[in-house]
């Protein structure tokens, strides 16, 4: 939708004559008829397909035409159209003499025509006027014209409708090409989406107006990056919503039990971290190199039994050294010079040759382990039974005798709400008086541990000997890149360098 505008500027008819050459009496009272139509190579009479417009009497014989937008838009003349502008046109402008006040075509004698001009060509939509002058033997007409789009229409053809708005359906103004230009603070195809406060957490926060940051349930703070603890939590905090991680000196599911042993007695030695683990009980987390209930004992590097195949360990100032029994060598006596011919497998283990007899492997009977089947399996050493269950060795297997209220292979299940295993991803289920609560493993959060969150597996500095730690984001595990001279999954073993 748009408007073809024609601005008449000057008409010259010095002799005051009609097209027939007959003079007007007393002078040529001149008005104009304009016909706008589709492009024709030769402009011919016929329907004015794009519209027509007539003026009142504008002057006598020769006159200049004043701009007059106030009087109903008389000059420039307006020819509105309700279609896509084709870019080409034909224009016919006729000057007529009005003997009386009735300007209708049927009220005028046919020889009242003063002059007729016809032009055709290309015309692009734009604000600039095109100036033209048409001359005949007796008259001259100077005029200019242009095509502009109607309000809310844009583009090369006035075919793009765009109406600026600032409401629920959009917040934008229109560019000259009809594309939307969002108001400050808004984005999206129709500028309906507010731009939240800078730094507002992408998952935990949202906004309903620009520069706002509203938090989803369970999150708080200016940027929605702080969690809210569980409703029943008393003396605790959280790292994910609805958790209740107890403050120092407090215990219980809702951190409402006063457990001040650490604060009152400071039992942990050698810079260890003390954690209250129950009423009047505590746990010391030792710094590297210390052990014991209260971390009171200095740890020998040989205590981890690094020497294999019966090798004996000797502490050294900068680590340890393995003295290997006959037939074994290597940093941890892990390599064997024996073969099956030496009957190296104990406790009824069967020997299998490897590498054309250069090496061997022992297949151990039940209850025995070690590279030579030299160790008796104690399946209870790892304390597999949870919730105070008692571990019993039963020949080649083990079983847990559970305390009342618990069940499962390892007494890990609370008999009641937790029986249906509601906690996902290995979350631990706790029965409450009414309901249950899940304690999630690292990397998971949510009411039922259903939400996977990225964790930094390197945060605990698991790599030794100045190795570089990398986090594998797909599995939330770490990989240690060892410096020269060290091996092991944590770069914990020095290599015997030549």
């Amino acid at each position: 939708s748009g408007v073809f505008q024609l601005q008449l500027q000057e008409f010259i008819n010095e002799r005051g004559v009609l097209a027939s050459g007959r003079p007007c009496e007393p002078g040529c009272r001149t008005f104009f008829r304009v016909c706008l139509k589709h492009f024709q190579a030769v402009v011919s009479p016929g329907p004015c397909t794009f519209g027509t417009v007539s003026t009142p009497v504008l002057g006598t014989n020769s006159f200049a035409v004043r701009d007059d937008s106030s009087g109903g838009g008389r000059n420039p003349l307006q020819l509105p159209f309700n279609f896509t502008w084709p870019g080409t046109f034909s224009l016919i402008i006729e000057a007529w003499h009005a003997p009386g006040d009735d300007l209708r075509p049927e009220a005028l004698p046919p020889d009242a025509l003063i002059s007729k001009i016809a032009i055709q060509g290309s015309l692009a939509v734009g604000q600039n006027w095109l100036l033209d002058e048409q001359t005949s033997t007796l008259t001259r007409l100077r005029y200019s014209y242009r095509v502009i789009c109607s309000d809310n229409y844009y583009g090369d053809n006035c075919s793009r409708l765009c109406k600026k708005r600032n409401d629920h359906f959009g917040h934008y103004v229109c560019q000259p090409d009809g594309n939307l230009s969002c108001l400050p603070g808004w984005t999206g195809e129709y500028c309906q989406q507010p731009i939240c406060l800078s730094g507002c957490h992408e998952q935990n926060g949202y906004c309903s107006k620009p520069a706002e940051c509203l938090c989803r349930p369970g999150w708080q703070g200016r940027l929605c990056n702080e969690c809210i603890p569980h409703n029943g939590c008393r003396h605790g905090t959280c790292s994910t919503p609805w958790q209740c991680t107890c403050d120092e000196g407090w215990g219980g599911l809702f951190c409402d039990q006063d457990l001040n042993y650490c604060t009152h007695h400071s039992p942990c030695k050698n810079g260890a971290t003390c954690s209250n683990s129950g009423q009047r009980s505590y746990t010391c987390t030792c710094r590297p190199g210390y052990t014991g209930v209260d971390c009171e004992l200095e740890l020998s590097e040989c205590d981890s039994n690094p020497c294999r195949n019966g090798g004996s360990c000797k502490d050294q100032e900068d680590g340890y050294h393995c003295l290997c029994p006959p037939g074994y060598y290597g940093l941890h006596c892990e390599h064997s010079t024996l073969s099956c011919a030496d009957s190296p497998c104990f406790n009824g283990g069967s020997c299998r040759e490897r590498n054309q007899g250069a090496n061997y492997a022992c297949e151990c009977p039940p209850n025995f382990t070690g590279s030579n089947c030299e160790k008796k399996v104690d399946r209870c050493t790892s304390n597999p039974c949870a919730n105070g269950g008692q571990c019993l060795n039963r020949g080649p297997s083990r079983m847990c005798r559970c305390r009342p209220g618990f069940t499962g292979t390892y007494c890990e299940l609370h008999v009641s709400d937790c029986a249906r295993n509601p906690c996902a991803h290995g979350g631990t289920c706790h029965d409450l008086e009414n309901g249950l609560m899940c304690t999630c493993p690292a990397g998971f959060s949510g009411r039922r541990c259903e939400v996977r969150t990225s964790i930094d597996a390197c945060a605990s500095s698991p790599c030794f000997n100045r190795a570089t730690c990398y986090t594998d984001l797909s599995t939330d595990t770490f990989v240690c890149n060892c410096p020269y001279g060290f091996v092991g999954s944590r770069c914990e073993f020095p290599v015997g360098l030549p």
């Epitope: 938090c215 349930p217 708080q220 703070g221 200016r222 809210i228 603890p229 939590c233 605790g236 009411r447």
Partner: antibody, heavy 118, light 107 residues
Framework: EVTLRESGPALVKPTQTLTLTCTAS????????MAWVRQPPGKGLEWVAT????????YYRDSVKGRFTISRDNSKNQLVLTMTNMDPVDTATYYC???????????WGQGTTVTVSS | DIVMTQSPDSLAVSLGERATINCRAS??????LAWYQQKPGQAPKLLIY???NLADGVPDRFSGSGSGTDFTLTISSLQAEDVAVYYC?????????FGGGTKVEIK
């Protein structure tokens, strides 16, 4: 036991200022977001304002924005609501509650009556 | 703002009988709904959160159900001490909004 105790009742004139104080005990006050909720006489509950525990971010219902200010003093375990340019429509029982705008209000004070009348 | 509509406005139930209160949200609030009990002259008390989780110390005759826009509070066997006004509240969208309340009396 969790206890929230609001300061005593008050009668104020329109346009005047009133400050309510809530003193908390039985939980680690600094760990939890807090709120004020009010109840006009014979009517239902309406949330008034909230303050976070982490950074003290505040939020208000539209009708009190610019007039009410919520703040907290963690060292004193106190929540404060300062109400300026008070209007008779602010007449209500004001409750101090533990919670945010996006979590349940787990614990409530006994409430204090505020009457705005000339 | 989300409008919470409770029904009925009041409810008279015989002792030991079941009482059911409904709450409807004007748009989806998922399961982020709480129920409160307010006895005459007292402050409100949290009964249920996240639609169906009982708050600490609440008797198990109270239960909640629903999701999205329609929610229900049920008292399976009404006791004399349950006479109160019950309010629902959504905390999914800002600002939090309460229902108008349902008064529960003994028939």
């Amino acid at each position: 036991e969790v206890t929230l105790r609001e300061s005593g009742p008050a009668l104020v004139k329109p346009t005047q200022t009133l400050t309510l104080t809530c003193t908390a005990s039985g939980f680690t006050f600094s760990n939890f977001p807090m709120a004020w909720v009010r109840q006009p006489p014979g009517k239902g509950l309406e949330w008034v304002a909230t303050i976070s525990s982490s950074d003290g971010t505040t939020y208000y219902r539209d009708s009190v924005k610019g007039r009410f200010t919520i703040s907290r003093d963690n060292s004193k375990n106190q929540l404060v609501l300062t109400m300026t340019n008070m209007d008779p429509v602010d007449t209500a029982t004001y409750y101090c509650a533990r919670g945010y705008y996006n979590s349940p209000f787990a614990y409530w004070g006994q409430g204090t009556t505020v009457t705005v009348s000339s | 703002d989300i409008v919470m509509t409770q029904s009925p406005d009041s409810l008279a139930v015989s002792l030991g009988e079941r009482a059911t209160i409904n709450c409807r949200a004007s748009e989806d609030i998922y399961s982020n709904l709480a129920w409160y009990q307010q006895k005459p002259g007292q402050a409100p008390k949290l009964l249920i959160y996240d639609t169906n989780n009982l708050a600490d110390g609440v008797p198990d005759r109270f239960s909640g159900s629903g999701s999205g826009t329609d929610f229900t509070l049920t008292i399976s066997s009404l006791q004399a001490e349950d006479v109160a006004v019950y309010y629902c509240q959504q905390y999914n969208n800002y600002p939090p909004t309460f229902g108008g309340g349902t008064k529960v009396e003994i028939k």
